[in-house]
């Protein structure tokens, strides 16, 4: 914590300018009253302070604001929320997308992975739902930012706003906010003919259940691998070797590239190795000829 | 084939939660989302809201605050817990399975279970 | 949300004539309908989806039409066994939101 001390008359300050600059940290300490701080925010970011006093200057937010800064402060932080931990922006109220698109610009280049995710968080908190604009917001100005927010957050998602979601924007997301975005893709993309819905569902697929992926075998779509590997493992599980070449068409052949690796090892395991050769792809690892298949899970189900 | 089965107690006391399950069998609750709907005696039906087998869920806004939808998949079974009942939730409560599968693209319900009625009352 | 509204509320047919019920929503939901059949003490059955196409061992004599608000449930020639609550739901968006029912019965 920076020593407290008397501010010396000639130092006292009644703006924020470039003369501050010259001030030492227990200077701007004493001398820079937070009220007057607070109502001249838009000025601060122009003025090339170090990081050292920009720690001055953000200590005298926080004892002015202990439960957080109000928007009006946020909106002009600039440079200043380099300095602010995920901590600090929890207390944080944001509903303007234009304080939400300054913040992410002045974060671009810097590791504020953490800080950026709390921030989308507010921003969702405060808006009431993850609504088209913060959508737009994100995709323009935080590529792959919508992957941030828990599935809690992105369940705010109309159906309807998801048709401004790039595939790009999705590629950090994790399973948990696949299985939360992909009912609301096929809902919002119901009404389109098969090969315009495969094109705009696609990248959300790996949030399908069994069914659908089944479904999607029988219309020709040529999946590509890349697609295929992302599909949940136990999507993937159930599908018979006549539908995975049905759902992969001319891919298929990139089944043996990716033979060891999940979903395709698991889903080779679960096959008969004569179906498996039928592929001709020299898949090995499938259930030998004249082995019993019992599925215990159905089962224990019943049981 | 695949067959639904829902239980739970019959009479629940007013403030008190409501607790159903669903159980699944003759087939993997992994394949499909499985819903709740409801129907109060002589009325109409009332979607409660859906569950995927991660746990992933979404409800009617009009029961959003009072609803949990759980899953678990190694007994093949979701639930529901509506907090906070009245006399208005007394209703037939049916589990039931949406299709929705994209070769015909929609949210609607192919396979339901026989259903159980909850009264509210005390 | 989006409101479905059946008529008639009651529909009074003999055995093997036509009869024809009506659902309306609020809002446009495409092709995105749904039908039901119910009987007292049991759950509904499925008998049309997308507006129009029988589900699986669905009888011809149903028939559905329509599309955007305005929708139509057919029944050519009433068996016995038709005489029952008949439900449209929507599933255009959430929340998924039923009629409430036209109940046919035996003139």
């Known amino acids: 914590d920076v020593e407290r001390t008397t501010c010396p008359p000639e130092k006292e300050v009644h703006e924020i300018d470039e003369s501050l600059i010259f001030y030492k940290k227990r200077e701007l300490e004493a001398c820079v009253d937070a009220a007057l701080l607070a109502a001249q925010m838009d000025r601060v970011d122009a003025i090339p302070f170090t990081y050292e006093q920009l720690d001055v200057l953000k200590h005298k937010l926080d004892e002015l604001y202990p439960q957080g800064y109000p928007e009006s402060v946020i909106r002009h932080l600039g440079h200043l929320f380099l300095k602010m931990s995920p901590e600090d922006i929890r207390k944080w109220n944001v509903t303007s997308l234009e304080t939400l698109k300054a913040l992410l610009k002045v974060s671009k280049g810097h590791e504020m992975s953490a800080q950026v995710a709390t921030l989308i968080d507010r921003v969702v908190v405060g808006r009431g739902q993850l609504d088209k604009d913060t959508v737009d917001t994100l995709t323009a100005f935080c590529p792959g930012c919508l992957c941030s927010l828990s599935p809690e957050r992105l369940s705010s998602v109309p159906p309807s706003v998801i048709g401004a979601v790039r595939p790009q924007d999705l590629d950090t997301c994790g399973p948990r906010q696949l299985d939360v975005l992909y009912p609301k893709a096929r809902l919002a993309f119901q009404n389109m003919s098969g090969s315009e819905y495969f094109v705009k569902i696609r990248p959300f697929l790996g949030g399908a259940p069994t069914e659908d992926v089944k479904a999607l075998s029988q219309q020709n779509v040529s999946m590509d691998l890349a697609t295929f590997m992302k599909l949940r493992r136990e999507a993937v599980l159930p599908l018979t070797v006549a539908e995975v070449q049905k759902l992969l068409g001319p891919h298929v052949e990139g089944l043996k590239v990716e033979e060891q690796h999940s979903p395709v090892r698991d889903w080779i395991l679960k096959q008969r190795q004569d179906d498996l050769d039928t592929l001709g792809l020299g898949l090995q690892g499938g259930i030998p000829n004249g082995y019993l298949i019992l599925d215990l899970s159905v089962r224990e189900a019943l049981s | 084939q695949v067959q639904l089965q829902e239980s739970g107690p019959g009479l629940v006391k007013p403030s008190e939660t409501l607790s159903l399950t669903c159980t699944v069998s003759?087939?993997?609750?992994?394949?499909?989302?499985w819903s709740w709907v409801r129907q109060p005696p002589g009325k109409g039906l009332e979607w409660i809201g859906y569950?995927?087998?991660?746990?992933?869920?979404n409800a009617n806004p009009s029961l959003k605050s009072r609803v949990i939808i759980s899953v678990d998949t190694s007994k093949n079974q979701f639930s529901l817990k509506l907090s906070s009942v009245t006399a208005a939730d007394t209703a037939v409560y049916y589990c039931?399975?949406?299709?929705?599968?994209?070769?015909?693209?929609?949210?609607?319900?192919?396979?339901w279970g026989r259903g159980t009625l909850v009264t509210v009352s005390s | 949300e989006i409101v479905m509204t059946q008529s008639p509320a009651t529909l009074s047919v003999s055995p093997g004539e036509r009869a024809t019920l009506s659902c309306r929503a609020s809002?446009?939901?495409?092709?995105?309908l749904a039908w039901y059949q119910q009987k007292p003490g049991q759950a509904p059955r499925l008998l049309i989806y997308?507006?129009?196409t029988r589900a699986t061992g669905i009888p011809a004599r149903f028939s559905g039409s329509g599309s955007g608000t305005e929708f139509t449930l057919t029944i050519s020639s009433l068996q016995s066994e038709d005489f029952a609550v008949y439900y449209c739901?929507?599933?255009?968006?959430?929340?998924?939101?039923f009629g409430q029912g036209t109940r046919l019965e035996i003139k």
């Open positions: 569950i995927f087998y991660s746990g992933s869920t």
């Open positions: 809002q446009s939901v495409n092709s995105n």
């Open positions: 003759g087939g993997s609750i992994q394949n499909y989302y």
């Open positions: 997308g507006a129009s």
């Open positions: 039931a399975r949406e299709v929705g599968r994209i070769a015909v693209a929609g949210w609607f319900f192919d396979l």
């Open positions: 739901q929507q599933y255009n968006n959430w929340p998924l939101t």
